[in-house]
């Protein structure tokens, strides 16, 4: 049974990746990105079930393809560059889902843009952290 | 409603110049990236050239780079194509379109002007 | 440079259905896009994301992809379908806007 110190540990390493989420859509998703609407042609892939921390998988196999779109975005509002916001999410997926486990991610039909995958992990993040509190 | 029209086409010899005119209306003009596509008589559609909202950044299509010049006046609400040595092959409609800020593409297009270059 | 390659021309009777196919290698991973220029006019986006369509258009347009095809479906075409229709997107880094050299759709 988990701990009470591995749920605060599995909390505060959702809202820091949570965090990292949010930024990232805060520094894209604005009239003030002029690369805004090259990045939404970028197709994302969207988890078919998200509810628990093992369907971080789905999110770990679209971290490249963001860290490329990212790229594209070069943006100010990021105070760190795309290689090392992406590999520090990595981390954080990485020890959440836990490396022994071998998930399968099963993918649904519709694709999404940029916005709509962040906001949709970002949600994920938010319900996770909810049940823990 | 929301409406760019254009002003400014015409003939012109090559080698010569020509500025072209977008005027918005009904949208924040200064909160959109704007673009100018143009079409060769017969041809597809080519992107030509990107502004971003407040002017300061600028992307070119190969083809035009170095000879075209886009800007905008948001407190005008008029974006500009400035067109510099001017070749035979730039003969086109050109088209102004708004970059949506939801959409990957361009969402409001403005009518058309002829552009002919001719001696 | 990176091509979206369209056919030049498609011809449907009325209530017939019209398919226009747009191949670009980025496709697995960039949307497709379409528009309809009816003569002496502006493009009109009539889907966007590859399957949506926005409002105003009607729902016998449709769209997919798959691979590194797209797709625009025109169920039971009409007589005010006839029109040139253009796939637009940009090359596998976002960097350069593309699109088709458009396909020439007539319905009689």
């Known amino acids: 049974a988990p701990t009470s110190s591995s749920t605060k540990k599995t909390q505060l390493q959702l809202e820091h990746l949570l965090l990292d989420l949010q930024m990232i859509l805060n520094g894209i998703n604005n009239y003030k990105n002029p690369k805004l609407t090259r990045m939404l042609t970028f197709k994302f892939y969207m988890p078919k079930k998200a509810t628990e921390l093992k369907h971080l998988q789905c999110l770990e196999e679209e971290l490249k393809p963001l860290e490329e779109v990212l790229n594209l975005a070069q943006s100010k509002n990021f105070h760190l560059r795309p290689r090392d916001l992406i590999s520090n999410i990595n981390v954080i997926v990485l020890e959440l889902k836990g490396s022994e486990t071998t998930f399968m991610c099963e993918y649904a039909d519709e694709t999404a843009t940029i916005v709509e995958f962040l906001n949709r992990w970002i949600t994920f993040c938010q319900s996770i952290i909810s049940t823990l509190t | 409603q929301v409406q760019l029209v254009q002003s400014g086409g015409g003939v012109v010899q090559p080698g010569r110049s020509l500025r072209l005119s977008c005027a918005a209306s009904g949208f924040t003009f200064s909160n959109y990236a704007m673009n100018w596509v143009r079409q060769a008589p017969g041809k597809g559609l080519e992107w030509v050239t990107l502004?971003?909202?407040?002017?300061?950044?600028?992307y070119y299509a190969d083809s035009v780079k170095g000879r075209f010049t886009t800007s905008r006046d948001n407190s005008k609400n008029t974006l500009y194509l400035q067109m510099n040595s001017l070749r035979a092959e730039d003969t086109a409609v050109y088209y102004c379109a708004r970059d949506s800020t939801t959409l990957g593409a361009f969402d409001v297009w403005g009518q058309g002007t002829m552009v002919t270059v001719s001696s | 440079s990176y091509e979206l390659t369209q056919p030049p021309s498609l011809s449907v009777s009325p209530g017939q259905t019209a398919t226009i196919s747009c191949s670009g290698d980025?496709?697995?991973?960039?949307?497709a896009y379409w528009y309809q220029q009816k003569s002496g006019q502006a493009p009109v986006l009539v889907i966007y994301e590859d399957t949506r369509r926005p409002s105003g258009i009607p729902e016998r347009f449709s769209g997919s992809s798959s691979g590194t095809m797209a797709t625009l479906t025109i169920s039971g075409a009409q007589v005010e379908d006839e029109a040139d229709y253009f796939c637009y997107s940009t090359d596998t880094t976002g960097t350069h806007r593309v699109f088709g050299g458009g396909t020439k759709l007539t319905v009689l």
């Open positions: 502004i971003s909202y407040d002017g300061s950044q600028k």
């Open positions: 980025a496709f697995p991973r960039k949307f």
